[in-house]
């Protein structure tokens, strides 16, 4: 009696199942009690000897490529051996690599967690994922795993992490880069500093006083509010960051405490108060202000 090994499918793709069947065309399985064993190269597969003429392999990988055969043994210990069958496992090259961010959109608050998720639409086997920072890429990390996605995590984002990023996926057919993704690090405003600038050392009534408010840190745009004794004088915007100024034509009522507030939508901070006092120098004909 002749024995045949049939693999289904005969040209499997990596990760897919294969059924090996040990066929005996001229014998019914009811004619005799047989034990079956499947081999790859020189190694027995699965449970070894079994009464089933089929062996189900859950997932085939590139390294499972090889020469397969089966043996059947009767109760009388007569062993039949099939011819060898070559099974070539086909690897699918990586394709359509993309990089996404968590949080989505690439906007992240300073100190928060950022995850760069590299995905491939297609690709089988061990895929090596690499993450790069900057258009001229600095390699951050590489991971090799049998999955279509991999993650790179920055647990606590800093201002210096604001950059372009991309990832590369590779499974033996050459590297395939994703598109660029830009990360914007949103920074809450720091406590602003208020400075009073007058045209002379001692400002007089009718002089123009410049209130300059500046938060040294914070993502633009920054909106600055100016206060005199907690009464709003007005607001100024700094679309590109930096400080902003508010001008005031002085009267005697402008004595008192001044402060400013910076707000960029990520939180507001109030400056320390700056006090402006009138002084009347001896023999002077006009009031003066000092701060």
């Amino acid at each position: 009696a002749e024995l045949f090994l049939i693999a289904s499918p005969s040209h499997p793709t990596e990760g897919s199942p294969v059924t090996l069947t040990c066929k005996m065309p001229f014998l019914q399985s009811s004619d005799a009690q047989f034990q079956f064993c499947f081999f790859r190269d020189t190694r027995a597969l699965g449970p070894g000897w079994s009464s089933s003429p089929k062996l189900q392999i859950a997932a085939m990988w590139k390294e499972d490529t090889g020469s397969y055969w089966c043996e059947a043994q009767t109760m009388a210990s007569k062993v039949l051996r099939s011819r060898r069958s070559q099974i070539n496992v086909h690897r699918v090259p990586v394709a359509d690599v993309s990089l996404e961010t968590q949080p989505p959109g690439g906007q992240v608050m300073e100190g928060d967690r950022l995850v760069l998720i590299c995905s491939v639409a297609m690709g089988t086997g061990d895929i090596t994922f690499l993450w790069y920072k900057g258009a001229v890429g600095l390699n951050l990390q590489s991971k090799t795993q049998r999955s279509l996605t991999a993650e790179y995590e920055i647990p606590s984002v800093r201002e210096s992490d604001a950059e372009q990023y991309y990832c590369v996926a590779e499974n033996g057919y050459g590297p395939s880069p994703s598109g660029l993704v830009s990360i914007t690090v949103r920074i809450p405003v720091s406590r602003p500093i208020l400075m009073l600038r007058a045209p002379r050392a001692q400002a007089a009534v009718e002089d123009v006083l410049e209130l300059h408010c500046e938060a040294l840190r914070g993502s633009p745009p920054i909106l600055y509010w100016f206060y005199h004794e907690d009464i709003t004088l007005g607001s100024r915007s700094a679309p590109s960051g930096g400080g902003a100024s508010f001008n005031l034509s002085l009267t005697e009522e402008h004595s008192g405490n001044y402060s400013c507030e910076a707000n960029n939508g990520l939180g507001a901070q109030r400056s320390e108060a700056v006090t402006l006092n009138f002084t009347v120098p001896t023999g002077a004909r006009s009031n003066h202000l000092t701060s």
Epitope: G106, Y132, A135, V136, G137, L138, N139, Q164, Y166, V168, P175, P177, S178, G179, L180, V181, S182, T184
Partner: antibody, heavy 119, light 112 residues
């Protein structure tokens, strides 16, 4: 297929401004940086800077800061280069080019736009 | 700025003969990531530049194997093993390692 198509030649007066466009097609516009290169008549090539269309963030050669403003419009897949306060030495052909990261090279170039500054 | 100096500036060649262009940078153009971003472009009259070689010695797809690049650090060379008529034009080396990125002044290759 990938294409970068630039706007036509411009004749402009000294002191004026001009905006050159570079329309991209055949790929995802926000996935690659667009660079600009200057070539004065009979001269070599000078790198001006790049823009990332994803967020409109530009990076300039210091020499061209103040002279050049790079912008991009995602909705039309178009990059722009504006030249201001034009002088005769700004007369040149200006090229846009796509640069592929990881492999790192300019793989596609626009056909060039001649800007002539003359009164 | 990194100055890229090419030589010769003009190169008359004989068809079928080899040709060589040198490019020297004023400082090392090895990037902090270990790569050297040295490229060669060919610009034919009235056309945009076209990429030939990237990262010193990698030939761009579709570029004939008669073109080869070599070098390291500050000294780089582009070689054409057998010049063909379609090879005429101006050859530029370019460094993309240090901002501002810079081109060489160009080498004009023409048939004798």
């Amino acid at each position: 297929q990938v294409q970068l198509v630039q706007s036509g030649a411009e004749l402009v007066k000294p002191g004026a401004s001009v905006k050159v466009s570079c329309k991209a097609s055949g790929y995802t516009f926000t996935s690659y940086n667009i660079h600009w290169v200057k070539q004065a008549p009979g001269q070599g090539l000078e790198w001006i800077g790049w823009i990332y269309p994803g967020d409109g963030n530009p990076k300039y050669n210091e020499k061209f800061k103040g002279k050049t403003t790079l912008t991009a419009d995602k909705s039309t897949s178009t990059a722009y280069m504006e030249l201001s306060s034009l002088r005769s030495e700004d007369t040149a052909v200006y090229f846009c080019a796509r640069r592929i990261h990881y492999y790192d090279y300019f793989d596609y170039w626009g056909q060039g736009t001649l800007v002539t500054v003359s009164s | 700025d990194v100055v890229m100096t090419q030589s010769p500036l003009s190169l008359p060649v004989t068809l079928g003969e080899p040709a060589s262009i040198s490019c020297r940078s004023s400082q090392s153009i090895v990037h902090s990531n270990g790569n050297t971003y040295l490229e060669w472009y060919l610009q034919k009259p009235g056309q945009s530049p076209k990429l030939l070689i990237y990262k010193i010695s990698n030939r761009f797809s579709g570029v004939p194997d008669r073109f080869s690049g070599s070098g390291s650090g500050t000294d780089f060379t582009l070689k054409i093993s057998r010049v063909e008529a379609e090879d005429v034009g101006v050859y530029y080396c370019f460094q993309g390692s240090h901002v501002p990125w810079t081109f060489g002044q160009g080498t004009k290759v023409e048939i004798k």
